[in-house]
């Protein structure tokens, strides 16, 4: 004959454990029902009555089957540098993640405790490693033959244009300027400057110095950062 199904509360057989979605109540010494996600134990079980569950109040939650006396409080509202990617419901906590252009500098179990703006690479530097949800941008100086004339968290170093006749040579922060005749190619071979693999890292060696990043021209220079209260258009 099949074993008879026990209804909670029931005394477990010696050496056995309670079933799924049940817990052992030390006081009653019985297997009792857990409360479902979104609920909590309003009244604990006795030898003769099962757990009484109640719904979580507003701004509180339980995510798992449980027998907690009170639901957990949802986290505080997301800050201005964050977006709410999961709302606070009776069954789940609010999750805040960093808004675009920011990354999580200090994470918590779910979501982010502290967001920080992604680093912007200044002219002469390009993005060597893009920012992610949890890591900042890494900027590197533009290699010879490449340039960046922006302050950006996304722009990489781009190759100088190749001219038939160069009016002004390019440098790390400025493209080459051609004479009025059109350039032979708009881009140098290789298309973009990406970080070299780690295996090429030189240690205690002296690479050939790059050309100086200081051109003698006083025009066609990149736009710089702007005063905080005066917009973002530079001069």
């Amino acid at each position: 004959l099949p074993a008879q199904v026990a209804f909670t509360p029931y005394a477990p057989e010696p050496g056995s454990t309670c079933r799924l979605r049940e817990y052992y109540d030390q006081t009653a010494q019985m297997c009792c029902s857990k409360c479902s996600p979104g609920q909590h134990a309003k009244v604990f079980c006795t030898k003769t009555s099962d757990t009484v569950c109640d719904s979580c109040e507003d701004s509180t939650y339980t995510q798992l089957w449980n027998w907690v006396p009170e639901c957990l409080s949802c986290g505080s509202r997301c800050s201005s540098d964050q977006v709410e990617t999961q709302a606070c419901t009776r069954e789940q906590n609010r999750i805040c993640t960093c808004r675009p252009g920011w990354y999580c500098a200090l994470s918590k179990q779910e979501g982010c405790r502290l967001c920080a703006p992604l680093r912007k690479c200044r002219p002469g530097f390009g993005v060597a490693r893009p920012g992610t949800e949890t890591s900042d941008v890494v900027c590197k100086p533009c290699a010879p033959g490449t340039f960046s004339n922006t302050t950006s968290s996304t722009d990489i170093c781009r190759p100088h244009q190749i001219c038939n006749v160069v009016a002004i040579p390019g440098n790390a922060s400025m493209d080459a300027v051609c004479t009025s005749t059109s350039p032979t190619r708009s881009m140098a071979p290789g298309a973009v400057h990406l970080p070299q693999p780690v295996s090429t890292r030189s240690q205690h060696t002296q690479p050939t110095p790059e050309p100086s990043t200081a051109p003698s021209t006083s025009f066609l220079l990149p736009m710089g950062p702007s005063p905080p209260a005066e917009g973002s258009t530079g001069d």
């Epitope: 680093r119 912007k120 690479c121 200044r122 002219p123 002469g124 530097f125 060597a128 890494v138 900027c139 590197k140 100086p141 290699a143 302050t151 922060s173 970080p195 070299q196 090429t200 890292r201 030189s202 240690q203 060696t205 002296q206 690479p207 110095p209 790059e210 100086s212 990043t213 200081a214 051109p215 006083s218 025009f219 220079l221 990149p222 736009m223 710089g224 950062p225 702007s226 005063p227 905080p228 530079g234 001069d235």
Partner: antibody
């Protein structure tokens, strides 16, 4: 906490060379370039050059191209400056400083290393 | 190459004074200008970057501004601990320090 610890004072004879170190801690060494800056006694600051510890790429001020050689060892988080053919003009304090390539420039400095050239 | 001219080279002021230090660029440096403070026997310390931005941990009495190619560091109310030499530094077009302004108490 970000810290750049430079090696101790050096005394060199004219014509000899010295090598100064700058050990970084408290941040990812290869994510920043290291600048070197010279300060002669009672004088101002002179930018000498930078090195990217990740790849060994360098840039020098014209004045220091024949004088200074910049290197770095990523495994020990240390940057070096080698000063050759010393003369009395090289008597100075040399500083290292880090730079992440953002508008926030040289936000942490070493304490400086004094080099005295004397016969 | 860009030249930076700092003035005055020596400035005497009293505690509580509003102090302005000037730095003139020989050509456009597009706000990529920083100010460093150096006390005797110490390394330089970043005060202001990108012309206007106050470095973390620097007292709010320090501020930076600009008019054309003239850049200014202002100390709104001079404190005894502000006695130092101040250097401007351009990093738009290579790298260059000004000659410095030594600030002393009257």
């Amino acid at each position: 906490e970000v810290h750049l610890q430079q090696s101790g004072p050096e005394v060199g004879r004219p014509g000899s060379s010295v090598k100064i170190s700058c050990k970084a801690s408290g941040y990812t060494f290869t994510d920043y370039i290291i600048h070197w800056v010279k300060q002669s006694p009672g004088q101002g600051l002179e930018w000498m050059g930078w090195i990217d510890p990740d790849y060994g790429n360098t840039d020098y001020a014209d004045k220091f191209k024949k004088k200074a050689t910049l290197t770095a060892d990523a495994s020990s988080n240390t940057a070096f400056i080698h000063l050759s053919r010393l003369t009395s003009e090289d008597t100075a304090t040399y500083f290292c400083a880090r730079d992440d390539g953002s508008p926030l420039v040289m936000d942490a400095w070493g304490q400086g290393t004094s080099v005295t050239v004397s016969s | 190459n860009i030249q930076l001219t700092q003035s005055p080279s020596l400035l005497s002021a009293s505690v509580g004074d509003r102090v302005t230090l000037s730095c003139n660029g020989s050509q456009n440096i597009d706000n990529y200008l920083a100010w460093f403070q150096q006390k005797l026997g110490e390394a330089p310390k970043l005060l202001i970057y990108s012309t206007y931005s106050l470095q973390t941990g620097i007292p709010s009495r320090f501020s930076g501004s600009r008019s054309g190619t003239d850049y200014t560091l202002t100390i709104s109310s001079l404190q005894p601990e502000d006695v130092a030499t101040y250097f401007c530094f351009q990093y738009n077009n290579g790298y260059m320090f000004g000659a410095g302004t030594k600030l002393e108490l009257k």
